[in-house]
Interface confidence: low
Amino acid sequence: IQDSCSNCPAGTFCDNNRSQICSPCPPNSFSSAGGQRTCDICRQCKGVFRTRKECSSTSNAECDCISGFHCLGAGCTMCEQDCKQGQELTKKGCKDCCFGTFNDQKRGICRPWTNCSLDGKSVLVNGTKERDVVCGPSPADLSPGASSVTPPAPAREPGHSPQ
């Protein structure tokens, strides 16, 4: 004998208390597939979470993060604080990138500047907290006859000092 619950479509559940009649999911619950014996509780987007898509009888709510935060994890299971470019998030909040590192995004960690000399090149533009160095031609490529490129003086941002 075929289980009559299999006939219950998404958005309903098979109500054993009512002779396996397909009953609509109650408010704030959903079933995304047919034949379910219960409806799942809708996700609530509270606090730093913001509702991106309302819950319906057939699909869960989807959350993203309020301004100043970004999603982490599949389906935005966590919200992490945004930082400014030139910063990274530490246990004590947003902190400027260490000297010699940069971050050009509002999330993620500070990464080391490119070491131009490893590729036999020279520094054309110094790095900052927000931008990587720009490597130029190697010093050997700049023959006296060629138009020379002089790297700028080291950028000194106020208070930005090394280890």
Partner: antibody, heavy 119, light 107 residues
Framework: QVQLVQSGAEVKKPGSSVKVSCKAS????????ISWVRQAPGQGLEWMGG????????NYAQKFQGRVTITADESTSTAYMELSSLRSEDTAVYYC????????????WGQGTLVTVSS | DIELTQPPSVSVAPGQTARISCSGD??????ASWYQQKPGQAPVLVIY???NRPSGIPERFSGSNSGNTATLTISGTQAEDEADYYC??????????FGGGTKLTVL
């Protein structure tokens, strides 16, 4: 085992310059920052500035800006601190110190170099 | 720049707990380190990242940092702990600052 070995004591005249060296061994020289910290007799510790050898550009505490030059020679794993226009109040022990990779602590220190400025 | 203030001296009886404070505006927003310095020797890192102990540092050394104050605590103080202690911090830009130092006397 990381070691920082500094050059010997110096006696200098006011107005002259001194250059102290700090040779590192037992670690990857160019990926750690080397700082210079001084301590005048009976006084506390004072951060002067530092350099990441792999990147070359040094930065300095405001107090020493224009008077101190910190450099590094990767080929010999040696950092240098040159202080110019010496005056008597620059008489101090000068330490080089290595900042460890993940935090703000100086986990290895040189033995210190006494610089005496006297006429 | 942040300025760090320490008491010039702290005295403690052997076996008792010594607490050395270090204050600065919003110091808890930054990481604090502590150094021990004995006469004629280079400083030794005893606490970093507010409360972490480097290997080889006895468990009796601990640290905390919140609000405007970082504290170095030495439980069961021993005679060999008599030394000068310096707090140090760095903001995210890696500008380093030391406190003025505290002389710990074990009575």
């Amino acid at each position: 085992q990381v070691q920082l070995v500094q050059s010997g004591a110096e006696v200098k005249k006011p107005g002259s310059s001194v250059k102290v060296s700090c040779k590192a061994s037992g670690g990857t020289f160019n990926s750690y920052a080397i700082s210079w910290v001084r301590q005048a007799p009976g006084q506390g510790l004072e951060w002067m500035g530092g350099i990441i050898p792999g990147f070359g550009t040094a930065n300095y505490a405001q107090k020493f800006q224009g008077r101190v030059t910190i450099t590094a020679d990767e080929s010999t794993s040696t950092a240098y601190m040159e202080l110019s226009s010496l005056r008597s109040e620059d008489t101090a022990v000068y330490y080089c110190a290595r900042k460890n990779e993940e935090d703000g602590g100086f986990d290895h220190w040189g033995q210190g170099t006494l610089v005496t400025v006297s006429s | 720049d942040i300025e760090l203030t320490q008491p010039p001296s702290v005295s403690v009886a052997p076996g008792q707990t010594a607490r050395i404070s270090c204050s600065g505006d919003n110091l808890g927003d930054y990481y604090a380190s502590w150094y021990q310095q004995k006469p004629g020797q280079a400083p030794v890192l005893v606490i970093y990242d507010d409360s972490n102990r480097p290997s080889g540092i006895p468990e009796r050394f601990s640290g905390s940092n919140s609000g405007n104050t970082a504290t170095l605590t030495i439980s069961g103080t021993q005679a060999e702990d008599e030394a000068d202690y310096y707090c140090q911090t760095w903001d995210g830009t890696l500008h380093f600052v030391f406190g003025g130092g505290t002389k710990l006397t074990v009575l």
